[in-house]
Interface confidence: medium
């Protein structure tokens, strides 16, 4: 377990360095801003479980090693363009649902044993966000999510691998947007 944690922490220091700006931007802009709907909220404890956090990051690492397309980023600043802080959890809910339904479930036989442990965890987060909605028009959010979906679809199986490789970013973005 100590080796696993060491491996994850070195991975965080290395691979995740590239996403620090995105995550810092989210935090600086007030990641815990009050959502429009009180249902767009996840308890902090969901993100404070060392084992499943490690498994999520290990899964992302494993998939990113199989991802040859380093030019494309799915979860980045473009995804949040024009989306207010209070709407970001709702946006991440859409991304999470797409990732589960179109990527993780169909790819469930790959990247064992991590996939088998991470998918139920993410499915439970999705379930907890099932009543998360926003007031008014969400077209700007759907447009951003659609671009992500189109990118994954266009890349085919390698797009699915990329999405799995970015589960660390999905995890962090969910945490920053929804707690």
């Amino acid at each position: 377990m100590a080796a696993l944690q060491k491996s994850v922490s070195s991975f965080l220091m290395g691979t995740l360095a590239t996403s620090c700006l995105l995550l810092l931007a989210l935090l600086v802009q007030g990641g815990a801003a009050a959502p429009i709907s009180s249902h767009c909220r996840l308890d902090k404890s969901n993100f404070q479980q060392p084992y499943i956090t490690n498994r999520t990051f290990m899964l992302a690492k494993e998939a990113s090693l199989a991802d040859n397309n380093t030019d494309v980023r799915l979860i980045g600043e473009k995804l949040f363009h024009g989306v207010s802080m209070s709407e970001r959890c709702y946006l991440m809910k859409q991304v999470l649902n797409f990732t589960l339904e179109e990527v993780l479930f169909p790819q469930s036989d790959r990247f064992q044993p991590y996939m088998q442990e991470v998918v139920p965890f993410l499915a439970r987060l999705s379930n907890r966000l099932s009543t998360c909605h926003i007031e008014g028009d969400d077209l700007h959010i759907q447009r951003n999510v659609q671009k992500l979906k189109d990118t994954v679809k266009k890349l085919g199986e390698s797009g699915e691998i990329k999405a799995i490789g970015e589960l660390d970013l999905l995890f962090m973005s969910l945490r920053n947007a929804c707690i």
């Epitope: 339904e101 169909p106 469930s108 036989d109 790959r110 064992q112 088998q116 442990e117 998918v119």
Partner: antibody, heavy 117, light 107 residues
Framework: QVQLVQSGAEVKKPGASVKVSCKAS????????IHWIRQPPGKGLEWIGR????????YYNEKFKGRVTISADKSISTAYLQWSSLKASDTAMYYC??????????WGQGTLVTVSS | AIQLTQSPSSLSASVGDRVTITCSAS?????MHWYLQKPGQSPQLLIY???KLLSGVPSRFSGSGSGTDFTFTISSLEAEDAATYYC??????????FGQGTKVEIK
């Protein structure tokens, strides 16, 4: 509640084909794997294959590849198992079942396929 | 594909007895799931992810284990528990495999 209702029993001659249907209700059909599992009389459970209706992705047991086709029609929430070149040894109860994480929580009532000359 | 071997293949026990079934995998798996099947009925899931009881399943059923060795236990056998029990895994790509089954009879 989740329900899987299968088509009725079939009696076929060796060499013939059969298509068994599995109508799903009570959940989002496209979002869960549907498995087909068979059980010869008095024997254990044998996995045939699975389909993810959302994308149409299928996986098969190598043992049955070439003789089996699994498909799904999202518009009517129905999965199908088509079996060609039937043999007497294919006589079995055929079950469709829905995944629950990595287990199989919901089962159809089974369709008995009898292959006999 | 990963092979699952259950033991015993059958057993006879009295009401109130503690019953244990083991399932051994030919290589390491993440989780084991356990099913019950009564004559003329479809199988039903009892335990998923090695030790989690499906909602509505009596607490006398339990599961444990890791790696290649897993155990299913009925703490106090009841007459209605007469059935065949199967273990199942979904770790190997892309196979699902079942154990050959353990038939439990009431003395």
């Amino acid at each position: 509640q989740v329900q899987l209702v299968q088509s009725g029993a079939e009696v076929k001659k060796p060499g013939a084909s059969v298509k068994v249907s599995c109508k799903a209700s009570g959940y989002i059909f496209r979002s869960y794997w549907i498995h087909w599992i068979r059980q010869p009389p008095g024997k254990g459970l044998e996995w045939i294959g699975r389909i993810y209706p959302g994308t149409g992705r299928t996986y098969y047991n190598e043992k049955f590849k070439g003789r089996v086709t699994i498909s799904a029609d999202k518009s009517i929430s129905t999965a199908y198992l088509q079996w060609s070149s039937l043999k007497a040894s294919d006589t079995a109860m055929y079950y469709c079942a829905r995944s629950y994480d990595y287990s199989v929580a919901y089962w159809g009532q089974g369709t008995l396929v009898t292959v006999s000359s | 594909a990963i092979q699952l071997t259950q033991s015993p293949s059958s057993l006879s026990a009295s009401v109130g007895d503690r019953v244990t079934i083991t399932c051994s995998a030919s290589s390491s798996v993440s989780y084991m799931h356990w099913y019950l099947q009564k004559p003329g009925q479809s199988p039903q899931l009892l335990i998923y992810e090695t030790s989690k009881l499906l909602s509505g399943v009596p607490s006398r059923f339990s599961g444990s284990g890791s790696g290649t060795d897993f155990t299913f236990t009925i703490s106090s056998l009841e007459a209605e528990d007469a059935a065949t029990y199967y273990c199942q895994q979904w770790s190997s790509n892309p196979y699902i495999t079942f154990g050959q089954g353990t038939k439990v009879e009431i003395k």
